[in-house]
Interface confidence: low
């Protein structure tokens, strides 16, 4: 449905508040270093222009595409060249190349200061003084640090952020009310950002077909009573939504996501019995709720898969006539029967099935050739099952912190070239799989664990892509989206790695460690552990444990000392010497 003015169309569909918020998110995700005030000014100019187009769709420039309008606006920023360097070259290009150029310059790890949370009273005063600016600042700060954050979902986070301040700033104990809510929003926000980053990587690096396959599997698990045609329609619409958001088309994305939620709720009888509560909520909550809805119950008496996909004489005929549709049906049928499998496992099975048909449908006796295809699935299913069992046992034995440390050592030995902050961040997140998933019964463990690990390993992949240092990481990240985790699991110690020179400065600590939160102190210790492994990759678990225990005791002792700084200086030298001796450095 063509509109004379795309900007007027979206302004009317979304309303002024959402329009302004989404344009701010879009601009902050593109120009991540620009000051808040500059972005607000640009957003206000775009909004005023949009209003003129709403009044008269034939007005000058109202017929231009959103990319043209937004790109032209971004290219008016005076300091573009000095702040962003070669990104300024994007402005010499025409659409659609200009937008593609901006997208390529999005930075997953921008050089921005850590967000420090002010005192509760300071935040409440700021909230009361100017609520609108306070909430815009939240959108801006999150968007620039997470340039692929799912924009309509960020509106939902902002709504919850506002609700937290509205409630808690008038509570008797503001801090007790507000801080847990902010912690929860922060943790959920990081998880949401990472999940969306995987969707965008899937689309951008592996293509629409890869994303659609993921969506077929996930939606079939979630809506096992829905017909294949219904799931296909949802997959097509969902793919459009995420393609738009990952491509920076945030207004279209938010609009289409709202349409999809509306469709799902109007057709919930043919989709899922679990949607009723979600569909009673307001728009932002509704969309979020649908995205997180639990799996519906599987229909009773589903027939065996073998009949249609192995025993039928028409397998090759059906495959040849419409390959992706036939494979989609296979994936749908398998996934709806297996909510206990991870999506990536289901995709591996579908890939194995596809490869088998490619080979067998060209053979002299196709049926004979593919008759045992389901037997090939057994080792693929058992591998993640065994891995999860072993790691959950290790997690239960060690607890989260020490489990993270075990993973830190494991991954540093696999890919020691990767930067220490990245290894610490990724291994800490890998370690969280224990508390997140090991508590679940067997039937829920694999989808929880392996699909979560896919999200975390994608963080490693996107951070590594920015500054590639390891061929092994590149290989695991680029060869196959669904085999990333097995690829990393299969990596052994990198025998080609030349140990890092010993640098005492790396292991010098000061009294400031004593005032850090428990989490930040853990990160300091884990950073030291990674550096130790980089110096001595052949160190045994026992050696590393002894050094880390000594280190923990050293920190505890010096933090209790009267003259902390002197203690850290003197005892630190002794610790370094003892560690060198223990590790044979």
């Amino acid at each position: 449905d063509a509109h004379k003015s795309e900007v007027a169309h979206r302004f009317k569909d979304l309303g002024e508040e959402n329009f302004k918020a989404l344009v701010l998110i879009a601009f902050a995700q593109y120009l991540q270093q620009c000051p808040f005030e500059d972005h607000v000014k640009l957003v206000n100019e775009v909004t005023e222009f949009a209003k003129t187009c709403v009044a008269d769709e034939s007005a000058e420039n109202c017929d231009k595409s959103l990319h043209t309008l937004f790109g032209d606006k971004l290219c008016t920023v005076a300091t573009l060249r000095e702040t962003y360097g070669e990104m300024a070259d994007c402005c010499a290009k025409q659409e659609p190349e200009r937008n593609e150029c901006f997208l390529q310059h999005k930075d997953d790890n921008p050089n921005l200061p850590r967000l420090v949370r002010p005192e509760v009273d300071v935040m409440c005063t700021a909230f009361h003084d100017n609520e609108e600016t306070f909430l815009k600042k939240y959108l801006y700060e999150i968007a620039r640090r997470h340039p692929y954050f799912y924009a309509p979902e960020l509106l939902f986070f902002a709504k919850r952020y506002k609700a937290a301040f509205t409630e808690c700033c008038q509570a008797a104990d503001k801090a007790a009310c507000l801080l847990p809510k902010l912690d929860e929003l922060r943790d959920e926000g990081k998880a949401s950002s990472a999940k969306q980053r995987l969707k965008c990587a899937s689309l951008q690096k592996f293509g629409e077909r890869a994303f659609k396959a993921w969506a077929v599997a996930r939606l079939s698990q979630r809506f096992p009573k829905a017909e294949f045609a219904e799931v296909s329609k949802l997959v097509t619409d969902l793919t459009k939504v995420h393609t738009e958001c990952c491509h920076g088309d945030l207004l279209e994305c938010a609009d289409d996501r709202a349409d999809l939620a509306k469709y799902i709720c109007e057709n919930q009888d043919s989709i899922s019995s679990k949607l009723k509560e979600c569909c009673e909520k307001p728009l932002l909550e509704k969309s979020h709720c649908i995205a997180e809805v639990e799996n519906d119950e599987m229909p009773a008496d589903l027939p065996s898969l073998a009949a249609d996909f192995v025993e039928s004489k028409d397998v090759c005929k059906n495959y040849a006539e419409a390959k992706d549709v036939f494979l989609g049906m296979f994936l749908y049928e398998y996934a709806r029967r297996h909510p206990d499998y991870s999506v990536v496992l289901l995709l591996r099975l579908a890939k194995t099935y596809e490869t088998t048909l490619e080979k067998c449908c060209a053979a002299a006796d196709p049926h004979e050739c593919y008759a045992k295809v389901f037997d090939e699935f057994k080792p693929l299913v058992e591998e993640p099952q065994n891995l999860i069992k072993q790691n959950c046992e290790l997690f239960e034995q060690l607890g989260e912190y020490k489990f993270q440390n075990a993973l830190l050592v494991r991954y540093t030995k696999k890919v020691p070239q990767v930067s220490t902050p990245t290894l610490v961040e990724v291994s800490r997140n890998l370690g969280k799989v224990g508390s997140k998933c090991c508590k679940h019964p067997e039937a829920k463990r694999m989808p929880c664990a392996e699909d979560y690990l896919s999200v975390v390993l994608n963080q490693l992949c996107v951070l590594h892509e920015k500054t590639p240092v390891s061929d092994r990481v590149t290989k695991c990240c680029t060869e196959s989206l669904v085999n990333r985790r097995p690829c990393f699991s299969a990596l052994e110690v990198d025998e080609t790695y030349v140990p890092k020179e010993f640098n005492a400065e790396t292991f010098t600590f000061h009294a400031d460690i004593c005032t850090l939160s428990e989490k930040e102190r853990q990160i300091k210790k884990q950073t030291a552990l990674v550096e130790l492994v980089k110096h001595k990759p052949k160190a045994t678990k026992e050696q590393l444990k002894a050094v880390m225990d000594d280190f923990a005791a050293f920190v505890e002792k010096c933090c209790k000392a009267d003259d902390k700084e002197t203690c850290f200086a003197e005892e630190g030298k002794k610790l370094v010497a003892a560690s060198q001796a223990a590790l044979g450095l």
Epitope: K205, F206, G207, D324, E358, K475, T478, E479
Partner: nanobody, 123 residues
């Protein structure tokens, strides 16, 4: 309509080199594995080389290993086949073909084809 367009063919002496290009119009090659096939007069279609959509996987026919190199430049929406030490028996029409994401086992699995470019190796 999606189109692939080969270029870079021509007449070359034995032992010489050519670089073939396969460019796409109306769609982005980012999501497609691209293969090069060749067909000599009176012979069957033969797969020469293929590169996956990410560029992470490449394969070559045994007869061209070490002499031919396939590469891609997604920014230019183009895939290249660098052919060195060409032999007279490699005279053929060279075609590029596209399939979603990954290289396929046989020619009928490729969704889009170019018109072909003639390569003649002769002194």
């Amino acid at each position: 309509q999606v189109q692939l367009q080969e270029s870079g063919g021509g007449l070359v002496q034995p032992g010489g080199s050519l670089r073939l290009s396969c460019a796409a119009s109306r769609f982005t090659l980012d999501y497609y594995a691209i293969a090069w096939f060749r067909q000599a007069p009176g012979k069957d279609l033969e797969e020469v080389s293929c590169i996956s959509s990410s560029g992470g996987a490449t394969n070559y026919a045994d007869s061209v290993k070490g002499r031919f190199t396939i590469s891609r430049d997604n920014a230019k929406n183009t895939v290249y086949l660098q052919m060195n030490s060409l032999k007279p028996e490699e005279t053929a029409v060279y075609y590029c073909a596209a399939a979603t994401l990954e290289c396929r086992g046989r020619s009928s699995s490729y969704d889009y084809w170019g018109q072909g470019t003639q390569v003649t190796v002769s002194s």
